[in-house]
Interface confidence: low
Amino acid sequence: IWELKKDVYVVELDWYPDAPGEMVVLTCDTPEEDGITWTLDQSSEVLGSGKTLTIQVKEFGDAGQYTCHKGGEVLSHSLLLLHKKEDGIWSTDILKDQKEPKNKTFLRCEAKNYSGRFTCWWLTTISTDLTFSVKSSRGSSDPQGVTCGAATLSAERVRGDNKEYEYSVECQEDSACPAAEESLPIEVMVDAVHKLKYENYTSSFFIRDIIKPDPPKNLQLKPLKNSRQVEVSWEYPDTWSTPHSYFSLTFCVQVQGKSKREKKDRVFTDKTSATVICRKNASISVRAQDRYYSSSWSEWASVPCS
Amino acid sequence: RAVPGGSSPAWTQCQQLSQKLCTLAWSAHPLVGHMDLREEGDEETTNDVPHIQCGDGCDPQGLRDNSQFCLQRIHQGLIFYEKLLGSDIFTGEPSLLPDSPVGQLHASLLGLSQLLQPEGHHWETQQIPSLSPSQPWQRLLLRFKILRSLQAFVAVAARVFAHGAATLSP
């Protein structure tokens, strides 16, 4: 058993056949010594008396809010949550496996630049009685500070018969060093509580591996005289790290016909312009990627040819 | 070339070669990004590699003030990785394919380190750790880790030379 926060405790249970469970001793936070009784949740049934209560926690029926009273007055509360290990594996029931980039990916994180700011998100089908708290650090043995905000509901989607809820959190490394080569990964830890179930999820990454630039901005076409060719130009996204002579991007320019089956013409360039042939009804798209490290491409920025 | 006393390197040549190194490092092991090598207990292997750290002066401001600190650190790393790529880890079984980019990568590391430091002038170089994996699978894992680490190192080096070529070239 360990303390999650004040008056909230997590009991780690092996969800095993005939497992004896965990013996837990609760102590009433009061100078009083006698006349103390204990109840669980909303029930008025007295579970025991005295300053301490010893219980055997085996299943969810044994978890909940234990309250000690004296003469009708509430003295203190202890909320017991269960963290269960089933068939040798800690349960991961609250969050949905996003399966990208690999199985058992519950948290996904992205950064728009090297400033030390990143966003993580996760999915669940649970709509009520759900709380999250997020902690992060750079490295684990001698952790350096990363400050995370509160997790918020960022999207709701309907998937077949189910509703899916996306939560996200923004974090910022306290003393980020954008130009350095990271040697210790960022660790992100999410505590999830659904009713009386506790679970924790972790992710470990280098900022360089989760970089995904915003799409190029101010995408423009300039027709070239007496030619089917156009000059496409664009700019670095505002959110990208500066100076651009140091934090450089590379770009992919694509000409795509109306039909998805039409052949795509692609050009790769380090410049912020390119000359391409603009076909009727086609569109021109440009995306960006870190020039020197193959992290994710940005989403496409697009303009129609006509 | 950098010369004793600390004049500028051939920024543009260094830029071209470091960008080529980035391309080679990724073609040597493109799928490495899909393996979470941190799960494989890499403390003893990649903790010893020279990293370009915050105080090494490789940021734009540090390069403007005095690029020598940063160039020395990059040189140190290039020699370190050049030795690793020429070691038993890469030359032993399982042998690399004949057209593997590792050979080119090895030669380019040496080329860039020589651009940074002419003969007869020696910066301190870091000792290469004695890594002698006993099993072929351990050697494979070590290769992945080294290439993964090299990708991060050469990315920073390439940024330094690109910025130097754009802003510090005479």
Epitope: D14, W15, Y16, P17, D18, A19, E59, F60, K85, E86, D87, G88, I89, S91, T92, D93, I94, T125 | -
Partner: antibody
Framework: EFQLVQSGAEVKKPGASVKVSCKAS????????MNWVRQAPGQRLEWMGV????????TYNQKFKGRVTITVDTSASTAYMELSSLRSEDTAVYYC???????WGQGTLVTVSS | DIVMTQTPLSLPVTPGEPASISCRSS???????????LNWFLQKPGQSPQLLIY???TRASGVPDRFSGSGSGTDLTLKISRVEAEDVGVYYC?????????FGSGTKLEIK
């Protein structure tokens, strides 16, 4: 008393699907994962997958590459295992087993034959 | 997948004599929490498997104390101190340290 009661034997043609049920009683159905295991004649036991009845989350043995689907009907305290694209080598006894494998159903023989 | 190799394939024993079955795992089943995630089962002819031992060495309820489990993270052993006629059947080890859970090939215990 804990009990897992499975549906009766089935004979299927190659290419068909089979759905085996497992009705639980004597405990709170949603509190415990349900595993499915099969045993071909004279072969070792083979784990197929597991479901958490409370959330409907599943983990499958990749060997069955999308052929197996485990579901539950919590109102009926029943777990189901459906195996599609049946082949002769799927002839086996199929078992459901509660968390920790302490309690097993009696088994359902599925015969695949043309 | 973790491969479980069980020996012997067949084990003829005289009643009252001890018996030992070995199971080797291709990967350690010992977790950071100090527990070893291995089960032992007995499958009697025509019956479903029954759990004998879980967490490598803990006897399931109702299992006689002549059955014991021991081992390291990869080399596991089931011992029967004095074999009785009712102990005949096929014994299986099973790892539940990681998905997919896998079983050994089985050891058939017969009375001489």
């Amino acid at each position: 008393e804990f009990q897992l009661v499975q549906s009766g034997a089935e004979v299927k043609k190659p290419g068909a699907s089979v759905k085996v049920s497992c009705k639980a009683s004597g405990y709170t159905f949603t509190d415990h994962n349900m595993n499915w295991v099969r045993q071909a004649p004279g072969q070792r036991l083979e784990w197929m997958g597991v479901i958490n009845p409370n959330y409907g989350t599943t983990t499958y043995n990749q060997k069955f590459k999308g052929r197996v689907t485990i579901t539950v009907d919590t109102s009926a305290s029943t777990a189901y295992m459906e195996l599609s694209s049946l082949r002769s080598e799927d002839t086996a006894v199929y078992y459901c087993a509660r968390r920790g494998f302490a309690y097993w159903g009696q088994g359902t023989l599925v015969t695949v034959s043309s | 997948d973790i491969v479980m190799t069980q020996t012997p394939l067949s084990l003829p024993v005289t009643p009252g004599e001890p018996a030992s079955i070995s199971c080797r795992s291709s990967k350690s089943l010992l977790y950071k929490d100090g527990k070893t995630y291995l089960n032992w089962f007995l499958q009697k002819p025509g019956q479903s498997p029954q759990l004998l031992i879980y967490l490598m060495s803990t006897r399931a309820s109702g299992v006689p104390d002549r059955f014991s489990g021991s081992g390291s993270g990869t080399d596991l052993t089931l011992k029967i101190s004095r074999v009785e006629a009712e102990d005949v059947g096929v014994y299986y080890c099973q790892q539940i340290a990681e998905y997919p859970f896998t079983f050994g090939s089985g050891t058939k215990l017969e009375i001489k």
